[in-house]
């Protein structure tokens, strides 16, 4: 098989591709991000980084490969850089940056029913308990049908 993929130059903001073996069929390019603690992920065609809902758990991607059809896979246009998870999950502080499915909803720190202390403490302190630091985990007791019925009578 001969030929090579085109140089992947229309990259999303802050994404970097390193292609040490060039662009021939079978060659791989490593994905990385220009910013501290950011990760490269795949998003659906019509979703941008600003639009990611908290419940979406995008797939991390480490490389793209030049296929026999002379196309990059995954397509570089679908790869974005997002803030990575900070290593403070399950530490009894609700970290706004980790309060999403991608970071396992901060290991339960943002819901009263799952945080070990049974009291949600936001980080940073300015984080809104009805906003970025709200209980979002769909598996939490707060979101069970039984609890919702209870609230409706309350």
């Amino acid at each position: 098989m001969q030929g090579q993929c085109s140089v992947p130059n229309e990259l999303n903001s802050n994404l970097k591709l390193q292609c040490p073996d060039g662009y021939a069929i079978g060659s791989e390019c490593a994905t990385s991000c220009l910013d501290h603690n950011s990760e490269s992920i795949i998003l659906p065609m019509n979703v941008t980084v600003r639009d990611i809902p908290h419940w979406l758990n995008p797939t991390r991607v480490e490389r793209v490969v030049c296929t026999a059809g002379l196309k990059w896979y995954p397509h570089p246009a679908l790869i974005h850089c997002v803030k990575g998870c900070e290593p403070f999950m399950g530490d009894n502080y609700c970290d706004a940056i980790n309060n999403r499915a991608f970071c396992n909803y901060d290991g339960g720190d943002c819901c009263t029913s799952t945080v070990k202390t049974k009291k949600v403490t936001p980080f940073p302190m300015s984080c809104d308990l009805q906003g970025d630091c709200a209980c979002r985990d769909p598996q939490a007791q707060e979101h069970s049908r039984k609890d919702l019925r209870g609230y409706s009578h309350g």
């Epitope: 802050n14 220009l34 910013d35 501290h36 603690n37 600003r50 900070e86 290593p87 403070f88 970290d95 940056i97 980080f123 940073p124 302190m125 300015s126 984080c127």
Partner: antibody, heavy 122, light 106 residues
Amino acid sequence: QLQLQESGPGLVKPSETLSLTCTVSGGSISSSSYNWGWIRQPPGKGLEWIGSISSSGSTYFNPSLKSRVTISVDTSKNQFSLKLSSVTAADTAVYYCARSGYRPSFYAMDAWGQGTTVTVSS
Amino acid sequence: DIQLTQSPSSVSASVGDRVTITCRASQDISYWLAWYQQKPGKAPKLLIYAASSLQSGVPSRFSGSGSGTDFTLTISSLQPEDFATYYCQQAYLLHTFGGGTKVEIK
């Protein structure tokens, strides 16, 4: 208490490479929670971020300086270093090293060295 | 690159005055913004992080507000030791500093 101390030559000739080291005391540079960075301030002007390095060695740079900057870390000496190549008079500044991290300060720079003046002149 | 525009570039005020400094980002940075104080010949000192969280040991007369693109640093009652230059800094994407605001004695 964490302290940072810059060291290196105060005078560098044009076209040469500026080399500075920041020694960290009172804490470990290998802590995974922090980035270690360089900031400069030309005489009478504002602050300019140069770049940062994590304990794992990942580096991040100001796009306008990226082609000339190298930042490295030596965990055994609890130090990190800056190299800026092909310097000109415009690189004359006070150079600061600083720490940033998610905790406790949301990637703000919560600890700084006192700064070292570097003059580029022949 | 994210640009930060501070205003005013300088302000003259008296002890006891309320001083407000603004910082505008060229794009949405959520609350990834910090404020620093710098005195001549000294390194900057962190005052506020995450737009409105007061750094430990900083007097409560300093406060920060805002999110997105518009941010404010307020000194509720200016003290003699507060005459200095103040900088904002974003950490949403790499790092950028604002141009600075010098608070001078009227």
